[in-house]
């Protein structure tokens, strides 16, 4: 039975040209996290594997940095980066947990972080 929950940074906004940290946290389970995948729609951004370390997809190497922790830092943001991002936790024995973050990249300097929320 999957008892864990993923807490994410929720709906967030950031300025064009700036950077943002995408963060998820898995709680309420003793399952072992073997890998976390970061995806944007159907595109793989990055992998953090417990044994292998990090892998950044070649097309994102210049704008994506690993961490902090299991999170992901997006740099040199453009309006095209607006959209849904997913953290996919591969765990044993539970299976897969998925968290969703919506990022809005703004032209103006008015960019505020949204509230945190949980996804079961």
């Amino acid at each position: 039975m999957m008892t864990g929950t993923i807490e994410t940074t929720g709906n967030i906004s950031a300025e064009k040209g700036g950077s943002i940290i995408l963060q998820c946290h898995l709680s309420s389970t003793t399952a072992q996290v073997t890998q976390v995948n970061w995806e944007q729609q159907d595109q793989l951004l990055a992998i953090c594997n417990a044994d292998l370390g990090w892998h950044i997809s070649p097309s994102f190497k210049d704008r994506v940095a690993p961490g902090p922790g299991l999170g992901l830092t997006l740099q040199s943001l453009t309006v095209n980066d607006t959209g849904e991002y997913f953290c996919i936790y591969h765990t044993y024995p539970d299976g897969t947990y998925t968290g969703r973050i919506f990022l809005e990249v703004l032209e103006s300097s008015v960019a505020e972080h949204g509230a945190r929320f949980q996804i079961p």
């Epitope: 292998l52 370390g53 044993y92």
Partner: antibody
Amino acid sequence: EVQLVESGGGLVQPGGSLRLSCAASGFTFSSYSMNWVRQAPGKGLEWVSYISSSGTINYADSVKGRFTISRDNAKNSLYLQMNSLRAEDTAVYYCARHRIADSPSRAFDIWGQGTMVTVSS
Amino acid sequence: DIVMTQSPDSLAVSLGERATINCKSSQSVLFSSNNKNYLAWYQQKPGQPPKLLIYWASTRESGVPDRFSGSGSGTDFTLTISSLQAEDVAVYYCQQSYFFPTFGGGTKVEIK
């Protein structure tokens, strides 16, 4: 004695296929993450593929879409199915075990003797 | 990928003398959350597979003689053989695993 023994190497034409096997003994195979690492003749080492104890899989970009890693814990065996082989895949292929520690050291602690794969027409 | 650059490519050392091998990574391999450097050293003798000597940059693997030691942090690392023995003739590789694993090009150690 902890041991890994590879087999299945040989000469294959470009575009051909080969399946490598690695037989493990002397340890609880199902508890360990396993890898394939290759070494071209006279060259350095290149990590190829990984499979965790729970089945999570990763590949080097150079083999993604062509190679498939799998394991059979009941048979204490690791496999690498290699398709669409190229001349640059010519190498000794080693299976290697990930070291287990209190926190992951991310190092390969046990290696097999290797099996040679030659891709040539 | 992180590029691992070893130097020198080869070195000849007299028996009983010190051998020093350097490894430089193109990015830091220090993981701040646990303060560990994900850097390992391997020894490969002719016709044999690699053998793990050191992990976390400075922790010796069980059974490895204490004449082998590793040091360094961030991007610059060193493997030292304090008193070279005949059986130490081999190629030595560093490997990072902050990102998916990559290896240095190797350093060949011979007897002078």
